[in-house]
């Protein structure tokens, strides 16, 4: 009949059962063996099922499962028996706190349920089942309970602008095990944590400084503790509030001709910004506010202007970190004085431009004539030294004019000057220094070969490549040009009187 | 080893009571079953009832149902059976039990207590 | 409750026999089965527990078997020292119930 294992002991010791204990451990015995887990995790308050499972062979029984907490340097502590016939029996110190898992139940299985973990139930536990008939087997396991923390954020001192580094705030956890605490902010800023060990959890704790400005003012400062016993991670967030006040300034007097005798609804505002907001004192320096001036906080409204309303105003903003002052000069004009005095103003301006335009003009003719001098200068210096040049080649040129074959479309292409690339655009260049152009190997050629080459481009150039205005420009500077020759052969002759240079419409040099 | 002493001999008046104790040494005394047996003279063996000290619930053979008592005190590691309305059919050696394995059986048995009752 | 019926209830054999006694229960207990041994003015001895398993210091002539319902103790060549009662006990369910008993005598 059953029976159950005690806390010190499992079973008699009697040789058998040791025998049968023995056959157990070696794994000599085809008995079966438990099953549980090394690390059982709950969180604080859960339920933490402690499992001890026997799987044996077919006709093996389980006759009772006795659990005990077995910490390391303490004597074993009796928790329940559970017993195949008698049922569980849960000793006093752990009454109300251990229940068999809820049905259908399995004879073979051990498990218990521990019912709302505290940290105190954190350690070794041993499941002792005696099987009929391999004999008694034991396993361990150990509960870890999850101690999630309960965050807390310490605003630092107040912030006030133009403090140095300074303490923002702190963010304390203390859980098992240690939890993480960091921090989520778009401040920038510098954190530094420390964490102190205690017998059944640790506390962490983190602090965020900064240098305050008044841009922080607003921004959120977020602790963030995450824990294996947090399903999310847990924020706490602070609001910033850097103490601070701006410079101060008066709007109003932009333009000084609207602040004349007899307007009306005039106001001078003062601008100033601050944490905490800031209040607003307006004063005359030079004496008491004018009867009718209104204040209203920032804003100072007067009545219809009058020449008493002239005078120094001053603004004086404040709040609990500092003060500021600002201050203006009122002047109110008379109209009938003031219409001389704009007449003066219009004609002293109109003057002004007059003479600046002049002067620009003067400066326009002046540029456009020494540029016409020069150019006229290097016109007459180059066609000096193409006249030079054109009596030096003529002799050679004709030479090799009548050394070629008679048609000119059969020439190799290096004897061509200038080539068209099949571009219209090639024939238009307005440097005229791109007519004699200089081969590689320090060749030149003469007008005769550019003539030639005008009217092998033009033949090649398709129809269409061109503009109609371009390709008129181009047939007529070659009529021109043909004038001066005689064609023999395919072939251009020069006339007898032909030894004149022709630049046409283009600026070429034929 | 595994023992179990029980107290000596004991004669009854009809319609008295009687307390038969059983000292169990060797063994963890509070998570084994302790179950008592009894045998009129020439008769077979009768399970009575058993308990578990530890759980201090004792079941009881419908027979015996409201006449006997089992109980433990952990701190001797006694049982104690405690039958009521004695009659003389109620003669017999009175054993208790207990077993080698936890939750299995009878394997050890006490040496047997002789209850006479007799007018 | 579970009645266990224990036949024969009596039975003669000489030293040296093969002797074989039967249990049976009213309703299948697995193998919650234990068979003991009593000599007249002694307390039983436990022989076989679980049907089949021998307890320790038991000569390996004693055997058992059986599941369910049917259950038998064999004793392979009987000993002099053999000659006793035998009773079995089902422990499956309370109440726990014995055997009415065999009683073993010499021919």
């Known amino acids: 009949m059953p029976l159950s294992l005690g806390a010190e002991m499992w079973g008699p010791e009697a040789w058998l059962l040791l025998l049968l204990l023995l056959a157990s451990f070696t794994g000599r015995c085809p008995a079966g063996e438990l099953e549980t887990s090394d690390v059982v995790t709950v969180v604080l308050g859960q339920d933490a099922k402690l499992p001890c499972f026997y799987r044996g062979d077919s006709g093996e029984q389980v006759g009772q499962v006795a659990w005990a907490r077995v910490d390391a340097g303490e004597g074993a502590q009796e928790l329940a028996l559970l017993h195949s016939k008698y049922g569980l029996h849960v000793s006093p110190a752990y009454e109300g706190r251990v229940e068999q898992p809820p049905p259908p139940r399995n004879p073979l299985d051990g498990s218990v349920l521990l019912r709302n973990a505290v940290q105190a139930d954190e350690g070794e536990y041993e499941c002792r089942v005696s099987t009929f008939p391999a004999g008694s087997f034991q396993a361990r396991l150990r509960l870890r309970v999850l101690v999630p923390p309960l965050p807390s954020l310490n605003p630092g001192p107040a912030l006030e602008e133009g403090q140095g580094l300074t303490l923002a705030a702190s963010c304390t956890a203390e859980g098992s095990p240690a939890p993480s605490v960091t921090w989520d902010t778009e401040v920038k800023g510098t954190t530094s944590s420390r964490s102190f060990k205690h017998s059944r959890s640790a506390a962490v704790t983190s602090e965020f400084h900064l240098v305050p400005s008044r841009s922080m003012n607003g921004q959120p400062l977020t602790c963030v503790v995450s824990h294996p016993g947090l399903l999310q991670d847990q924020r706490i967030t602070h609001i910033l509030h850097v103490s601070f006040l701006a410079e101060a300034s008066v709007r109003g007097l932009e333009d000084q001709n609207l602040w004349h005798i007899g307007r009306e609804g005039a106001m001078l505002k003062c601008l100033s910004e601050g944490q905490p907001p800031p209040s607003y004192n307006w004063t005359r320096l030079d004496g008491p506010l004018p009867s009718g001036v209104r204040v209203d906080g920032d804003t100072l409204g007067f009545p219809p202007l009058t020449t008493e309303h002239s005078g120094i105003y001053v603004c004086h903003v404040s709040n609990e970190f500092s003060s500021r002052d600002s201050q203006v000069t009122v002047d109110v004009l008379d109209p009938q004085e003031d219409s001389g005095k704009q007449v003066d103003l219009v004609s002293a301006s109109v003057v002004v431009v007059g003479v600046i335009a002049a002067l620009l003009f003067c400066l326009l003719v002046v540029v456009v004539v020494l540029m016409s001098r020069y150019h006229r200068r290097k016109a007459q210096q180059m066609t000096q030294k193409y006249e030079e040049e054109l009596t030096l080649t003529r002799e050679n040129s004709i030479r090799r004019l009548h050394s070629h074959h008679t048609d000119p479309r059969s020439q190799p292409e290096e004897s061509v000057g200038l080539r068209a690339e099949g571009h219209p655009d090639s024939l238009k260049d307005n440097s005229s220094c791109s007519v004699m152009s200089e081969e590689p190997e320090g060749r030149s050629y003469s007008t005769l070969t550019t003539v030639r080459e005008i009217e092998t481009q033009t033949e090649l150039l398709s129809p269409g490549s061109g503009r109609a205005e371009e390709e008129e420009d181009q047939d007529e500077g070659i009529k021109q040009a043909m004038n001066h020759f005689v064609q023999e052969n395919g072939t251009l002759r020069a006339k007898p009187t032909g030894n004149g240079i022709y630049i046409n419409g283009r600026g070429h040099l034929v | 080893e595994v023992q179990l002493v029980q107290s000596g001999a004991e004669v009854k008046k009809p319609g008295a009571s009687v307390k038969v104790s059983c000292k169990a040494s060797g063994y963890t005394f509070t998570s084994y079953d302790i179950n008592w047996v009894r045998q009129a003279p020439g008769q077979g063996l009768e399970w009575m009832g058993g308990i578990i000290p530890i759980f201090g619930t004792a079941n009881y053979a419908q027979k015996f149902q409201g006449r006997v008592t089992i109980t433990a005190d952990e701190s001797t590691s006694t049982a104690y059976m405690e039958l009521r309305s004695l009659r003389s059919e109620d003669t017999a050696v009175y054993y208790c039990?207990?077993?080698?394995?936890?939750?299995?059986?009878?394997?050890?048995w006490g040496q047997g207590t002789l209850v006479t009752v007799s007018s | 409750d579970i009645q266990m019926t224990q036949s024969p209830s009596s039975l003669s054999a000489s030293v040296g026999d093969r002797v074989t006694i039967t249990c049976r229960a009213s309703q299948g207990i697995s193998n919650y089965l234990a068979w003991f041994q009593q000599k007249p003015g002694k307390a039983p001895k436990s022989l076989i527990s679980a049907a089949s398993s021998l307890q320790s210091g038991v000569p390996s002539r004693f055997s058992g078997s059986g599941s369910g319902t049917d259950f038998t103790l064999t004793i392979s060549s009987l000993q002099p020292e053999d000659f006793a009662t035998y009773y079995c006990l089902q422990h499956d369910s309370f109440p726990i119930t014995f055997g009415g008993g065999t009683k073993l005598e010499i021919k």
């Open positions: 039990a207990s077993t080698a394995v936890a939750g299995f059986g009878i394997d050890y």
